[in-house]
């Protein structure tokens, strides 16, 4: 780091390599929780209008497809991989696309996805086709 | 290679505005996202604002949107920050800083092209 910028003690805001270069924060959709109209589709659009720097270099995208009886809501946030959310782990942190996985949650249908490339949470991906290891 | 100075910085009331300049030497500029990164005393790094090279989609940390407007003029090889409504919490010093292209965007800060930063302070 240099010398005229200081490092502050146990600063989560200042997260380096291993050769101590500073990493650049992701950049997410970041709309919190709205109604959708994505259903049984392959692919969705978040059709969220907001860019966010996320606040923390470590924090990666996510998004959360919710149905109940009475609605679907799709949530776009940043968050860090190192912490639970929703109760889950984010397992698919470091993939560059949104691959929605189903997770069990009572009294709704639960899907949620994390991933590392800028604005990945954008375009959200139910397909089986991705689930397997896709290189894309 | 692009190297950055920082200037506009300086004291001004809670509620004024300042414009940030960043000046870049090199002829890559063009190539680069661009970003406004500050630091508060005793702080660590806050990421501000960025800006895309083509196009100049801009994007901005929720503490500041609203107030702050990042823009740059590739043929001066110079990115601003307009800062208006400023608060007692946005004294820092500010620096600019290049992203790298690449396939994705690197995610590492090239800390051989840091400038000095200029210091804003809002205070009564």
């Known amino acids: 780091i240099p010398p005229h910028v200081q490092k502050s003690v146990n600063n989560d805001m200042m997260v380096t390599d291993n050769n101590g270069a500073v990493k650049f924060p992701q950049l997410c959709k970041f709309c919190d929780v709205r109604f959708s109209t994505c259903d049984n589709q392959k692919s969705c659009l978040s059709n969220c209008s907001i860019t966010s720097i996320c606040e923390k270099p470590q924090e990666v995208c996510v998004a959360v497809w919710r149905k109940n009886d009475e609605n679907i809501t799709l949530e776009t946030v940043c968050h860090d991989p190192k912490l639970p959310y929703h109760d889950f782990i984010l397992e698919d942190a470091a993939s560059p696309k949104c691959i929605m996985k189903e997770k069990k949650k009572p009294g709704e249908t639960f899907f949620m996805c994390s991933c590392s490339s800028d604005e990945c949470n954008d375009n959200i991906i139910f397909s089986e086709e991705y689930n397997t290891s896709n290189p894309d | 290679e692009v190297q950055l100075l920082e200037s506009g910085g300086g004291l001004v009331q809670p509620g004024g505005s300042l414009r940030l300049s960043c000046a870049a030497s090199?002829?890559?500029?063009?190539?680069?996202r661009m970003w406004w990164v500050r630091q508060a005393p005793g702080k660590g790094l806050e990421w501000v604002s960025?800006?895309?090279?083509?196009?100049?989609?801009?994007y901005y940390a929720d503490s500041v949107r609203g107030r702050f407007t990042i823009s740059r003029d590739n043929s001066k090889n110079t990115l601003y920050l307009q800062m208006n409504s400023l608060r007692a919490e946005d004294t820092a010093v500010y620096y600019c800083?290049?992203?790298?292209?690449?396939?994705?965007?690197?995610?590492?800060?090239?800390?051989?092209?840091w400038g000095q930063g200029t210091l804003v302070t809002v205070s009564s």
């Open positions: 960025a800006i895309e090279p083509i196009g100049h989609r801009t």
């Open positions: 090199g002829s890559t500029f063009t190539e680069y």
């Open positions: 800083a290049k992203q790298a292209p690449g396939e994705k965007w690197a995610r590492r800060w090239d800390l051989d092209y």
